[in-house]
């Protein structure tokens, strides 16, 4: 029988009545077009919904948009279109919501062709009121808030001007022309690339990278011959053209571009690309595309300076620049990432790492599951996860994998069980231990969301037919109850719950269609009465993350420490609550070779924890670039993994001697950098 249909499932008492009393319908008498929904602030209950409708007429497009606001998590909505003067809002810019709990919102309006500039509507009170502001430019991008100060905004114009506002969009100043890409760094710093000759496209590889730390009063050129740049964690990366040919290399800076080092990564040609897959303050995952139109490349993981890289995974699926990769950070357990590889026979397989890219393995076959037609051996196969690539290929996959930091260990994903990803209709699988073991959770494709830090999982079947049923589980997906939320089925368009998985509410969006009319409709369901009481100490049990062998003294050690968590018992039907904080207890582990990555010039042979010298470098001095100088490295092949906290145990020696010899690309050496003032 399907999960949740056995007698073992403890049913939640009187849930139909409890949910019926907490189901709120909202109907919008709008023409059916598109709906976008944004949460404003954290735990405020404020939702903004923008409905838009386009009719392409012969000469122009007729557009209409409506704005609705809820302040009770979607139970009731008020039409506030009049607050934006019934103006048509451009959906491609979305709703720009301010960071943290600033309560700021910027909507970008559609303006007529001949106007001097664009128009925005600004709110700083969680969308209770809006101020109309006419812009001195036409925006090309959504307004970008400084992460440090939500009054500071930047935007690029259609003329490639970089515009900054210091008073939340009231007044704007163009601080630079000919700008291709701009990003906020830390401490209100802005990084941007500029072109000198024709355009961003024409000057690709000849761009300059600039920095301003005072919102455009003064500038510093921190790089030339730039192809592109990116920020990840505390690292600033620049892809720089080589002097002699059309290849480019990654350079990295950890001091906002004052000094640069050449990353020990392969250079790439014109048709290839680099991509930062994930980064934190400790390290970075970098994808380097293979030459040719292969659709794959190699993942490298960095050391703590972003300079020395270890090969992490070969044949990593990544279709094209800005294309699709399945690389997923499993946020519910430290060190876990899932991605796809393209095997030699062109099938796609899922791989998982539990130690931040140190080792990758296939996902364990779920218990009680059969291997599908892709499996050569019907008894031995793995789980393969559908993510961005499957979605882009229009497979029957409505959602990417889901995990939440406060729902410890839980990962939900569509998948198939075999030797590779299957094009057959997938099922939904769940892991409660961060990806080590998996169970089939639901038959067929579903939309799913996590509520109350994992206390409730909600799912809706993905169907082309109208729906009126949701499913929910209070025991991490073991048992499911179904609730009919309306007598009249709706064409489902989306499932929305407040980001952060702390909420108890979900909103189901869709539309109804009758002979002449079509209406938007939303149902918001509050699960607070299902979880009647607050969880107590007895509702939690202790769990050791990453445990694979209790007889191993260092069981659970990952990156030098192990963590025990208090986890909600599956049988406990209670509220974690909005203020729930994950209780965990770390303990430091002894160092072993697993806590070190192979240093520059060394590699790990498969299934070996020892680092050995790369044959081509045997007998050569190990020299590499650091801060524009050549360094001589004396090493026995190991460097501590970034973020690793182990102490004692194995301790390989390592020493770096400064050769004071210049070696980075000269266009990134500090002497060439100049400062300019406006």
């Amino acid at each position: 029988s399907a999960p949740g249909e056995d007698e073992e499932c403890g049913r939640v008492r009187d849930f139909v009545a409890k949910l019926a009393n907490n189901t709120h319908q909202h109907v919008a008498d709008d023409l059916r077009g598109s709906v976008s929904l944004s949460w404003v602030g954290d735990s405020t209950g404020v939702i903004l919904v923008l409905t838009t409708f386009h009719v392409p007429l012969v000469i122009m497009t007729f557009g209409q948009s409506k704005l609705y606001r809820s302040e009770d998590y979607g139970k009731n909505f008020k039409d506030i279109t009049d607050l934006i003067n019934n103006t048509f809002i451009r959906t491609e810019f979305g709703m720009a919501i301010g960071p943290e709990n600033s309560g700021k919102v910027v909507l970008t309006a559609e303006v007529s062709g001949g106007s001097r500039g664009g128009r925005i509507f600004r709110s700083s009170d969680f969308a209770k009121n809006f101020v109309q502001t006419d812009l001195p430019f036409h925006p090309l991008t959504q307004m970008m808030y400084s992460p440090q100060n939500s009054d500071y905004l930047l935007a690029l114009s259609t003329e490639n001007g970089l515009w900054v506002s210091k008073n939340f969009g009231g007044k704007w100043e163009e601080i630079h022309k000919a700008v291709c890409l701009a990003k906020w760094g830390s401490d209100n710093t802005i990084f941007f690339t500029t072109y000198a000759n024709g355009s961003c496209k024409a000057d690709l590889g000849a761009l300059e990278l600039w920095r301003t730390s005072d919102l455009g009063k003064s500038f510093k050129t921190i790089g030339v011959k730039i192809y592109s740049f990116g920020l990840g964690g505390r690292f600033l990366f620049a892809s720089v053209m080589a002097d002699k040919d059309t290849t480019r290399r990654i350079h990295v800076s950890t001091d906002q571009g004052d000094t640069w080092s050449m990353a020990q990564l392969p250079s790439v040609g014109q048709e290839q690309f680099y991509s930062i897959l994930a980064a934190n303050d400790d390290m970075v995952f970098m994808h380097v595309d293979e030459p040719g139109d292969t659709g794959f490349g190699t993942i490298f993981t960095s050391d703590d300076r972003g300079i020395v890289y270890s090969k992490s995974l070969d044949r990593h699926l990544y279709t094209t620049t800005g294309g699709e990769t399945d690389f997923t950070n499993v946020t519910s357990l430290r060190g876990v990432y899932i991605t796809s590889v393209l095997s030699e026979d062109n099938s796609i397989q899922t791989m998982i790492t539990f130690d931040q890219g140190g080792r990758w393995t296939h996902l364990r076959k779920p218990e009680n599951s059969e291997c599908d037609a892709t499996a050569k051996n019907k008894n031995e196969c793995s789980l393969h996860i559908h993510a961005s690539y499957s979605i882009s290929q229009k497979l029957n996959v409505p959602m990417a994998p889901l995990s939440e930091p406060n729902a410890v260990g839980i990962v939900i994903a569509h998948g198939s069980v075999g030797d590779a990803i299957s094009v057959m209709v997938p099922d939904v699988y769940i892991s409660d231990d961060g990806g080590y073991s998996w169970t089939k959770m639901l038959e067929g494709p579903h939309y799913y969301t996590i509520l109350d830090s994992g206390g409730i999982i909600v799912a809706i079947e993905h169907s082309s037919r109208p729906i009126n049923v949701i499913k929910f589980s209070t025991d991490e997906g073991q048992c499911w109850q179904t609730y009919t939320f309306t007598r009249d089925p709706i064409y489902f368009t989306g499932l929305a719950s407040e980001p952060g998985a702390r909420s108890m509410n979900i909103s189901i969006w869709g539309f109804t269609e009758s002979f002449l009319t079509s209406q938007w409709v939303s149902y918001t369901i509050d699960f607070k009465d299902i979880l009647e009481r607050n969880c107590e100490e007895k509702d939690y049990t202790i769990w050791l993350a990453h445990s694979t062998d209790p007889e191993d003294y260092e069981d659970g050690c990952i990156l030098g420490y192990k963590e025990q968590f208090l986890r909600l018992r599956k049988s406990s039907v209670c509220q974690n609550g909005r203020d729930y904080v994950v209780t965990k207890q770390p303990s430091i582990c002894l160092c072993s070779l697993e806590d070190f990555l192979c240093d520059f010039g060394y590699y790990r042979p498969e299934n070996d924890s020892k680092c050995v010298e790369q044959p081509e470098l045997k007998g050569h001095d190990l020299e590499f670039c650091l801060y524009g100088r050549e360094e001589h490295l004396t090493t026995n092949g190991y460097r501590k993994i970034p973020g690793d906290k182990c102490q004692g145990g194995v301790n390989p020696v390592r020493e770096v001697k400064d050769l004071k010899k210049k070696c980075t690309s000269n266009f990134l050496s500090p002497e060439k950098q100049n400062s300019k003032s406006n």
Partner: antibody, heavy 124, light 106 residues
Amino acid sequence: QVQLVQSGAEVKKPGSSVKVSCKASGGTFRNYAISWVRQAPGQGLEWMGGIIPIGGWANYAQKFQGRVTITADESTSTAYMELSSLRSEDTAVYYCARQGRKTGYYYYYGMDVWGQGTTVTVSS
Amino acid sequence: DIQMTQSPSTLSASVGDRVTITCRASQSISSWLAWYQQKPGKAPKLLIYKASSLESGVPSRFSGSGSGTEFTLTISSLQPDDFATYYCQQADGHITFGGGTKVEIK
């Protein structure tokens, strides 16, 4: 082979405290929870609480909350159970037991290794 | 706390008999149930964990089944060494034991 060896029998006066020790040998003590279970004469088994030596995370049955303290010393692979405000009803055999573990959950797989038991007699 | 009700409290049987002991939980405990055997003056011995998994070294005549709230321990063919008291124990809340079932010679 893992063994749990408990301290010897005790005779205590009502109102006093007793501390029973449980020393583990031949296994990875730190990676398993140790539970304490008691059995009054002619009665069934009653769980008192448990501890995970690594980190010292203890939890107790509601009935004994405030009266029992369970500790562990990782360096000597020893767990301790102290019961205070003793009364005659506390006369029982006290067992320590290792919680078997197949996954990261410490308490879900039954108690696979038991101590020989310590008889505590509370009498005035 | 979760209550565990064991039945019968006493069971008379002969060698070779098939013996069944049941245990009921006051709420669903999934499969988190263990069974123990205890002989007079001795510590309990684990027979079954996770409702149906046989502990290593335990004879295969012992088997467990059930999930949710209803569980069963079965001894397929009672041996002289099996006359003892049997306890069930749930592990999905603060641990609680059933009252015990004494299997005696008929």
